[in-house]
């Protein structure tokens, strides 16, 4: 598949030179689509173009992150006179065209959503053959993936002066609130770190000093649910044993 880099022509495509106002290039996408992790989501995208009876070869493309330059997650091509768009790329096999590009519909279905899919997506169509033309959505559609909390790591680590500290990291969207409970603790929010740069769905809470042996439980909760995990601290001659 030849991908042209001359996308500067997009501005020309919106001018009177190309077509009457009723048949300009345009793309219609919603600002945002929300879905839960593990489910499927549909990213709607329809378009208008000035070549009303175009029957030549076409390519439909979806990319993630940024328009024009972001990585492609889906691509299909339809031959002249065909309504069958043959998939050439579907990242991890999770992207499937729902719409019919011949009928101005590039809507995409994303299966088995993960929090990592939470980003902006951009649809694009390219005509080849008699007509060489292309258009891509500038603003795209934001896929907002929500998820119940999941504790991804819980551990006990040594700290200075023969003490121990506990770390709990959880992911979820909205980012979960974390709380520790354990011997002589009651319920403690402990030191909760803000979501880390580039890891917007991860939250970490630290118990800086574990003073008693026993079971320490981390609970993560958001509007979609809660999750908990425990570690055990046993001190034998200055050593620790931890299990979850």
């Amino acid at each position: 598949f030849v991908r042209t880099k001359i996308d500067t022509t997009e501005n020309l495509l919106n001018t009177e030179v190309h077509s009457s106002p009723a048949q300009r290039w345009s793309m219609q996408v919603p600002p945002e689509v929300s879905a839960e992790a593990g489910d499927a989501a549909v990213l709607p995208c329809t378009f208008t173009h000035p070549h009303r009876h175009y029957d030549g070869p076409l390519t439909a493309i979806w990319r993630a992150g940024e328009p024009y330059a972001g990585p492609q997650v889906f691509r299909c091509a339809a031959a002249r006179g065909s309504e069958l768009c043959q998939t050439a790329l579907s990242l991890h096999g999770r992207f499937r065209l729902l719409g019919n590009p011949r009928r101005n519909d590039l809507s995409l279905r994303v299966e088995r959503l993960a929090l990592a899919d939470d980003r902006r997506y951009f649809c694009r169509v390219e005509f080849a053959g008699d007509v060489h033309d292309r258009y891509e959505s500038r603003h795209g559609v934001r896929l907002h993936v929500t998820a119940a909390p999941r504790i991804v790591n819980i551990s006990v680590l040594p700290s200075p002066a023969h003490a121990f500290r506990a770390l709990c990291t959880a992911e979820g969207e909205p980012p979960p609130a974390l709380a520790w409970s354990g011997p002589a603790l009651g319920n403690s929010l402990a030191a909760v770190r803000s979501p880390r740069e580039g890891h917007g769905h991860l939250v970490t809470a630290e118990l800086p000093a574990l003073t008693h042996d026993g079971r320490y439980t981390c609970t993560a909760a958001n509007s979609l649910g809660r999750s908990e995990a425990s570690v055990y601290l046993f001190r034998f001659h200055g050593a620790s044993g931890a299990s979850t």
Partner: antibody, heavy 116, light 112 residues
């Protein structure tokens, strides 16, 4: 030139199954849907469904779900339709059609006769 | 399902004259993209159907320009000018806007 060549006439017993074929030539088989159409003797045309060879795209007329099963073999550029639990109502000529706009070329038809 | 109706079961015509065959749909076949998803087919006696017109008014490859299609969203006409003996057979309209695709009952063109 584009051609769709269908398998020969079939005489089958009630309750049995039959599989008819449609071999395409003269174009890239995987680029176009293959449609299947039923025509009972002296009657009109009825769309059964269509398959996109080499893709997961299969569409059925609800009326024929459970009756017709569409498959395709890319390596031989052949589409197949299996008809199951046959009754006298299934006695008909079955056509495949493909290429531009889905219906630009038609096979010569396969006559299926269901009779005890 | 969209119902396609061809009211006239048969239309007699004299060779050299013009004739119109009509078809109606229970729902508009005009898509938001401006195209009208209607086909016209001719099935000559003992033969397979042949595509004449696609998207209501576009002549299929190899079809003589004596054939023409027109219409609105729900009412369609196939016009044949200078009818020839080889034009006899059944003419079917078909919608492919929505699944399942549906055909009209057919109109038989016969020579007077």
């Amino acid at each position: 030139q584009v051609q769709l060549k269908q398998s020969g006439a079939e005489l089958v017993k009630p309750g049995a199954s039959v599989k008819i074929s449609c071999k395409a030539s003269g174009y890239i088989f995987t680029d176009y849907y293959v449609n299947w159409v039923k025509q009972r003797p002296g009657q009109g045309l009825e769309w059964i469904g269509k398959i996109g060879p080499g893709s997961v795209s299969i569409y059925y007329n609800e009326k024929f779900k459970g009756k017709a099963t569409l498959t395709a073999d890319k390596s031989s550029s052949t589409a197949y339709m299996q008809l199951s639990s046959l009754t006298s109502e299934d006695s008909a000529v079955y056509f495949c059609a493909s290429y531009y706009y889905g219906f630009a070329y038609w096979g010569q038809g396969t006559l299926v006769t269901v009779s005890a | 399902d969209i119902v396609m109706t061809q009211a006239a079961p048969s239309v007699p015509v004299t060779p050299g004259e013009s004739v119109s065959i009509s078809c109606r749909s229970s729902k508009s076949l005009l898509h938001s993209n401006g195209n009208t998803y209607l086909y016209w087919f001719l099935q000559r006696p003992g033969q397979s159907p042949q595509l004449l017109i696609y998207r209501m008014s576009n002549l299929a490859s190899g079809v003589p320009d004596r054939f023409g299609g027109s219409g609105s969203g729900t009412a369609f006409t196939l016009r044949i000018s200078r009818v020839e003996a080889e034009d006899v057979g059944f003419y079917y309209c078909m919608q492919h806007l929505e699944y399942p695709y549906t055909f009209g009952g057919g109109t038989r063109l016969e020579i007077k």
